[in-house]
């Protein structure tokens, strides 16, 4: 039968080295065997490149395309092929569809004055446009009480958050995770970082009385 696209490709760029496109076919498809996504920068002399998609689900395909360090003017022509059949054609401007890289190395350290210091790494090198543009969201949740969670917006430059131990339940196990976004690029949120877990051993003041 004929091959059809149910949901056309949706693409995001990490604005440093990779753009990822995802789309859904109208029936289960072996993406890597049946489909190819060609991409070409709209720039004089540029070559046509081919991405071999992989299956994310039975009918969902995803393609990761290596790109050069992106700049605002970059526009790519995308063509989705099933053999000689052109299924979809469109354009993609990475700077208009940014999904930041995931923050890394989230750690929790005890700090002075009964505070926890949460630290993570900015996923971009200092020379990249996004390095100084990221703001973060930190989610802290009680592992044993789904109702006990807090969300912190970190809008200052440093990838750190100081957390008063007294704001958390004593003796409880907590997990934290962090994600990033770039306001000036009107980006989507990054994926969440892996969680890090710690025991909040702060002793409330009343117990000293």
């Amino acid at each position: 039968g004929s091959v059809k696209v149910l949901h056309e490709p949706s693409c995001f760029s990490d604005y440093i080295s990779t753009s990822v496109c995802q789309w859904k076919m109208d029936h289960p498809t072996n993406c890597s065997a049946e489909l190819r996504l060609s991409y070409q920068l709209d720039f004089m002399g540029s070559e046509n490149h081919t991405c071999v998609p992989e299956n994310r689900e039975d009918s969902v395909c995803v393609c990761s395309m290596p790109i050069d360090d992106a700049v605002e003017a970059d526009v790519y022509q995308l063509d989705l092929w099933a053999g000689q059949q052109l299924l979809w054609s469109g354009s993609f401007q990475p700077s208009k569809h940014v999904k930041p890289r995931t923050p890394g190395n989230l750690t929790v350290h005890p700090n002075i004055s009964h505070t926890w210091l949460l630290m993570w790494t900015n996923p971009y090198p200092t020379e990249n446009h996004l390095h100084s543009e990221l703001t973060y969201m930190v989610n802290v949740s009680n592992d044993n009480d789904p109702e006990d969670f807090k969300v912190y917006n970190v809008t200052y430059m440093g990838p750190t958050l100081r957390l008063a131990a007294s704001t958390l339940k004593s003796g409880a196990s907590y997990s934290a995770r962090v994600r990033a976004w770039a306001q000036t690029y009107n980006s989507t949120w990054s994926d969440w970082s892996p969680s890090t877990t710690w025991l909040n051993y702060y002793e409330p003041w009343e117990q000293h009385l």
């Epitope: 920068l41 720039f43 004089m44 002399g45 540029s46 070559e47 046509n48 490149h49 290596p66 790109i67 050069d68 700049v71 605002e72 003017a73 970059d74």
Partner: antibody, heavy 125, light 112 residues
């Protein structure tokens, strides 16, 4: 050492055809776009055409579009310019030049960083 | 099409002096910050052209630092300091951003 050697220039009548060749050596030919530039006697430089490294994309000046065809044989390290329906105003020295590196996603630009010695095309009855 | 305009069309300079040539484009040649697709070429009498400057300000291999390029957007300048007799020839600017590529009319530099 990078070398570009053009050949094929000749005296030809208006309406006639000619094929210029440019043999390259000293660099990885298939990785670079190549360009033809011409210079009419006593005049300035005029860009003619460009072809990317794979040969998959070509560009032309309006003055030659539909009459000239740029091509390349990467196995032979050779660039070509097929010129048809020649006119008196096509009389010029034709230079081939190495252009941008196109094997990267965004071509890396170094200008026209090496030129051949040129070949003279004369169109006259 | 992008039109390239050079001034002056001819220039006479004494050895040791500085020569300046201006090039203006009808559209911006800036693709992104630091990437101005404007080149300068020199054609000495009886020779093929040779590259001097690319991307507005980067010197081609083997070009002495007496040659410098500056500018962005639509306005660019080539400066030749401590001019020598060997610098005589015609200087061309060229835009390499989009098809059709285009050269300026050329500036003839004469050494007094």
């Amino acid at each position: 050492e990078v070398q570009l050697v053009e050949s094929g220039g000749d005296l030809v009548k208006p309406g006639g055809s000619l094929r210029l060749s440019c043999v390259a050596s000293g660099f990885t030919f298939r990785d670079y776009a190549m360009t033809w530039v011409r210079q009419a006697p006593g005049k300035g430089l005029q860009w003619v055409s460009l072809i990317n490294g794979s040969g998959g994309k070509t560009y032309y000046a309006d003055a030659v579009k539909g009459r000239f065809t740029i091509s390349r044989d990467n196995a032979k390290n050779t660039l070509y310019l097929q010129m048809n329906s020649l006119r008196a105003e096509d009389t010029a020295v034709y230079y081939c030049a190495v252009d941008r590196l196109t094997k990267t996603i965004r071509p890396q630009y170094y200008g026209l960083w090496h030129w051949g010695q040129g070949t003279l095309v004369t169109v006259s009855s | 099409d992008i039109v390239m305009t050079q001034t002056p069309l001819s220039l006479s300079v004494s050895p040791g002096e500085t020569a300046s040539i201006s090039c203006r484009s009808s559209q911006s040649l800036t693709y992104s910050i630091g990437y101005n697709y404007l080149d300068w070429y020199l054609q000495k009498p009886g020779q093929s052209p040779q590259g001097l400057i690319y991307l507005g300000s980067k010197r081609a291999s083997g070009v002495p630092d007496r040659f410098s390029g500056s500018g962005s957007g639509t306005d660019f300048t080539l400066r030749i300091s401590r001019v020598e007799a060997n610098d005589t020839g015609v200087y061309y600017c060229m835009q390499g951003l989009q098809s059709p590529l285009g050269f300026g009319q050329g500036t003839k530099l004469e050494i007094k």
